[in-house]
Interface confidence: medium
């Protein structure tokens, strides 16, 4: 296989957790025998097994060029490159193969493809019926009892990554953007990566671009906000059910913690406190309706 | 890398059928790509013909929908176009290219062929 | 079908000088997860395409770090820092939000 730019299995390194940090093997790869041995299938994907004690540790130690060169992986994750997504295979002992050259995006309508392999690249479809043009990836509920374009967009499951828009407003992931933009039936854009500051000339907004884009969610990319980037969160334990009232609960790895990741239109530790300043919708048969 | 040869008669007679194939090499066309077709008759700009994925779904431009076909030959790792009922406006450079593509990403058309000449003419 | 709109058509530099291309979709290309599916590609004479940028502002593998493309929704701009003898050629957008994919007319990078 090609070594990874910038360092291949075992020269360098880092690992959940913070710089210098190991995996502990035995979390990672069940094994049948209670012997704790470093053997080649204690610590796959480049890693360097170490006894530590009573248990084994997964060593991956990657030195990792930053340069922005996106591959998908087979996860459904963007790299920043080749080597932090063979990094990640490392890390999760979990083997991440690239798809494809570029960073992975998602499109829940896959057009004119027939598989789920085949993709169709964006096509955007847009549905016209009683309600007149739906746009945004809004769609016509014509059963609804006043008839109105709907947006099914579910932003729950996305991570933290604020964004600043065309209508001057920030939003806490591009998936608030698309929401809000199919909601109001109006287009909205992403202006650039990070909150809006006010240096951001409103009258601007949504015009010539000053060259700052958006970047895709880039999993790996750097030591800070691991919790955020590295996707080591874990299902809550049973004995937290209920924790989250309008969320999902996430046991983080690294900081041994639960946290709430709210659902659309929730704020408060445990996702019990109502958000209005998200969005202003009527809800029709769970879905929401664009007044 | 994956390299593409387009083969295919130089001229054609008006009203007659053109047939191109384009030969893969340096990969499978059974991977994640979308195989195209795109054109440029003399001194103009570029027009996107139509494209085959290696299951056999097809898109195609509207504008020449009603005239061609694109088809795969996955045992001989080729594809390949016919255009009816040509007319001299159908004279141009057809390029065969590879559009990476998938539902989850996206990296355009990053491998093209060198070009074929076709003529309509009698 | 989305229209695109290059300008200028023709553009004469000198090598060394910075250049910049403009290309106008006649609707957004901003996907609904923030990406601009917007490619560029050059054409050397004689030559087939040959691809730059993808989803706005990628470079793709093996183009040097003089070209960038910024812009996004309708309005996306190709530049190049410092023009060598090697960028002549002429540059096509290529909008790949929706089929059928279309390119701009062409902008002739030149000479001056």
């Known amino acids: 296989s090609n070594q990874p730019p910038g360092g291949g299995g075992g020269s360098g390194g880092d690992c959940p957790g913070g710089k210098g940090k190991s995996i502990n093997c035995s979390e990672l790869n069940v094994r049948e025998s209670d012997v704790r041995v470093c053997d080649e299938s204690s610590c796959k994907y480049g890693g360097v097994c170490k006894e530590d004690g009573d248990g084994l540790k997964c060593a991956c130690q990657f030195q990792c060029h930053t340069n922005y060169i996106p591959v998908c992986g087979s996860n459904g994750d963007t790299y920043q490159n080749e080597c932090f997504l063979r990094r990640a295979a490392c890390k999760h002992q979990k083997e991440i193969t690239v798809i494809a050259r570029g960073p992975c995006y998602s499109d829940n309508g896959s057009g004119s493809g027939e598989g789920e392999e085949e993709g169709s690249g964006a096509e955007v479809h847009r549905k016209h019926s009683k309600c007149g043009p739906c746009k945004y990836k809004a769609e016509c509920d014509e059963d609804a009892e006043n008839v109105g374009c709907v947006c099914n967009i579910d932003c729950s499951g996305y991570s933290f990554n604020p964004v600043c828009a065309s209508d001057g407003s920030s939003y806490n992931n591009p998936c608030f953007v698309r929401e809000a933009s199919c909601i109001k039936q109006e287009q909205i854009d992403i202006r650039h990566l990070g909150h809006c500051t006010d240096t951001d000339d409103t009258s601007l907004l949504g015009k010539k671009d000053d060259g700052l884009q958006y970047r895709p969610d880039v999993k790996d990319a750097s030591d800070q906000r691991e919790d955020v980037y590295i996707g080591n969160h874990m299902p809550c334990p049973e004995n937290l059910n209920g924790y989250c009232i309008h969320g999902k609960c996430e046991f983080i790895y690294s900081t041994q913690k639960a946290s709430c990741r709210c659902e659309s239109g929730y704020t408060g530790q445990h996702c019990e406190k109502t958000d209005f300043s998200i969005l202003y919708v009527v809800p029709s048969r769970q879905k929401l309706t664009h007044v | 890398q994956v390299q593409l040869q387009e083969s295919g008669p130089g001229l054609v007679k008006p009203s007659g059928t053109l047939s191109l194939t384009c030969a893969v090499s340096?990969?499978?066309?059974?991977?994640?790509?979308?195989w195209s077709w795109v054109r440029q008759p003399p001194g103009k700009g570029l027009e996107w013909i139509g494209e085959?994925?290696?299951?056999?779904?097809?898109n195609y431009n509207p504008s020449l929908k009603s005239r061609v076909t694109i088809s795969v030959d996955k045992s001989k790792n080729q594809f390949s176009l016919k255009l009816s009922s040509v007319t001299a406006a159908d004279t141009a450079v057809y390029y065969c290219?590879?559009?990476?593509?998938?539902?989850?990403?996206?990296?355009?058309?990053?491998?093209w062929g060198q070009g074929t000449t076709v003529t309509v003419s009698s | 079908d989305i229209v695109m709109t290059q300008s200028p058509l023709s553009l004469p530099v000198t090598p060394g000088e910075p250049a910049s291309i403009s290309c106008r979709s006649s609707?957004?290309?901003?996907?609904?997860?923030?990406?601009?599916?917007l490619d560029w590609y050059l054409q050397k004479p004689g030559q087939s395409p040959q691809f730059l940028i993808y989803?706005?502002?990628n470079r793709a593998s093996g183009v040097p770090d003089r070209f960038s493309g910024v812009g996004s929704g309708t309005d996306f701009t190709l530049q190049i820092s410092r023009v060598e003898a090697e960028d002549f050629g002429v540059y096509y957008c290529?909008?790949?939000?929706?089929?059928?994919?279309?390119f701009g007319q062409g902008t002739k990078l030149e000479i001056k």
């Open positions: 609707q957004s290309l901003l996907h609904s997860d923030g990406y601009n599916f």
């Open positions: 989803l706005g502002s």
């Open positions: 340096g990969g499978s066309i059974s991977s994640s790509n979308w």
């Open positions: 290219a590879t559009m990476v593509r998938g539902r989850y990403y996206y990296y355009g058309m990053d491998v």
């Open positions: 085959i994925y290696h299951s056999g779904s097809t």
């Open positions: 290529m909008q790949a939000l929706q089929a059928p994919w279309t």
